[in-house]
Interface confidence: low
């Protein structure tokens, strides 16, 4: 049992709390006035507008991502690049491995809700980075599909499909009815792409551009 406070103890506690709140308010006002004084002496308009822009940008992204992990880009203290926590970053993009099993369409919707798309792989280096975060006994949807079943593959972000930068498993793609692409592991040839039925649920990889603030 927690003993009930005596009325005077409660009043004393309340008085202390009020004192703390007021002292914090006074300190805040003092700090603000110092800031205003400094800003009137030194022209900090640029820094101020940059901060305002940052805050509005962060607010804009908060609807998708309540938490961002940011790193300083280069030596300039002004430029920060961010990825949603706990996404991983590579070059100018952020990646998220979705472990829920969904159809290709639902997977793409799931990514778009987070302000992203199913992954578009542009280089061997990018694929090598991505596979570090994948499980060998799982398959993951890519943002690559052939909606008409005519072997006209297209990326979700309209990046041109370049036959020279594809990583299909040998013998793939091999079925006109299989109109969506996954990346998976085959013991004979490691990681590669395979065409599959779009409705068969798989895990997926989302990709979005880094947020620069």
């Amino acid at each position: 049992m927690v003993p009930e406070e005596e009325p005077q103890d409660r009043e004393k506690g309340l008085w202390w709390f009020q004192l703390k709140v007021w002292s914090m308010a006074v300190v805040s006002i003092l700090l603000l006035s110092v800031c205003f004084t400094v800003s009137s002496v030194v022209p900090h308009n640029f820094m101020y507008s940059k901060t305002v822009k940052r805050l509005s940008k962060l607010r804009e992204y908060q609807q998708y991502h309540p938490s961002l992990t940011c790193v300083m880009e280069g030596k300039d203290i002004e430029d920060w690049s961010c990825c949603p926590t706990p996404w991983t970053s590579f070059q100018s993009s952020c990646y998220f491995i979705s472990t829920g099993m969904q159809s290709w369409t639902k997977s793409q919707k799931n990514c778009s809700v987070m302000g992203a798309d199913l992954v578009v792989i542009n280089t061997r280096e990018e694929q090598d980075f991505i596979i570090q975060n994948l499980k060998r006994n799982s398959s993951y949807f890519l943002g690559l599909s052939d909606p008409g079943g005519r072997r006209h593959w297209q990326w979700v972000d309209q990046t041109p499909y370049n036959e020279n930068v594809t990583f299909w498993h040998s013998g793939e793609p091999n079925n006109l009815d299989e109109r969506c692409a996954i990346i998976n592991f085959r013991s004979s040839e490691e990681w590669g792409w395979n065409d599959i039925h779009c409705h068969v649920p798989q895990k997926s990889i989302c990709k979005m551009k880094k947020i620069y603030i």
Epitope: M101, N137, S138, N174, I196, H199, K203
Partner: nanobody
């Protein structure tokens, strides 16, 4: 929506046989691995047998080896699970599901059907 449909379950005596069938709606089995799973009340879903459609290789869980046989009927686009010498321990809901390799974890198989109940009485 692509889904698999199981059939052939029922109530049998210990030592009897049953043949379960798994048929897809919306796609063909070519190139997929099809697994048979079972889930007894209060237990986790376990993989009992699987067939890799790409190479025809089959896999069995230790407790069913020699009693269960998984096979593919290409003409009918159906996967069968022949269960012989059934035991009360085999009582469960049996499901089939699709993946790319038989060694995938149950969570990585998709297109689960509703399941078919198999009850083995002693």
């Amino acid at each position: 929506q692509v889904q698999l449909q199981e059939s052939g379950g029922g109530l049998v005596q210990a030592g009897d046989s049953l043949r379960l069938s798994c048929a897809p709606s919306g796609f063909t089995f070519d190139g997929y691995a099809i697994g048979w799973f079972r889930q007894a009340p209060g237990k986790e879903r376990e993989k009992v047998a699987c067939i890799n459609k790409s190479d025809g290789l089959t896999y069995y869980e230790d407790s069913v080896k020699g009693r269960f046989t998984i096979s593919s009927d290409t003409a009918k686009n159906t996967i069968h699970l022949q269960m012989n010498s059934l035991k009360p321990d085999d009582t469960a809901v049996y499901y089939c599901a699709a993946a790319w390799e038989c060694d995938y974890a149950p969570a990585d198989f998709g297109s689960w059907g509703q399941g078919t109940q198999v009850t083995v009485s002693s």
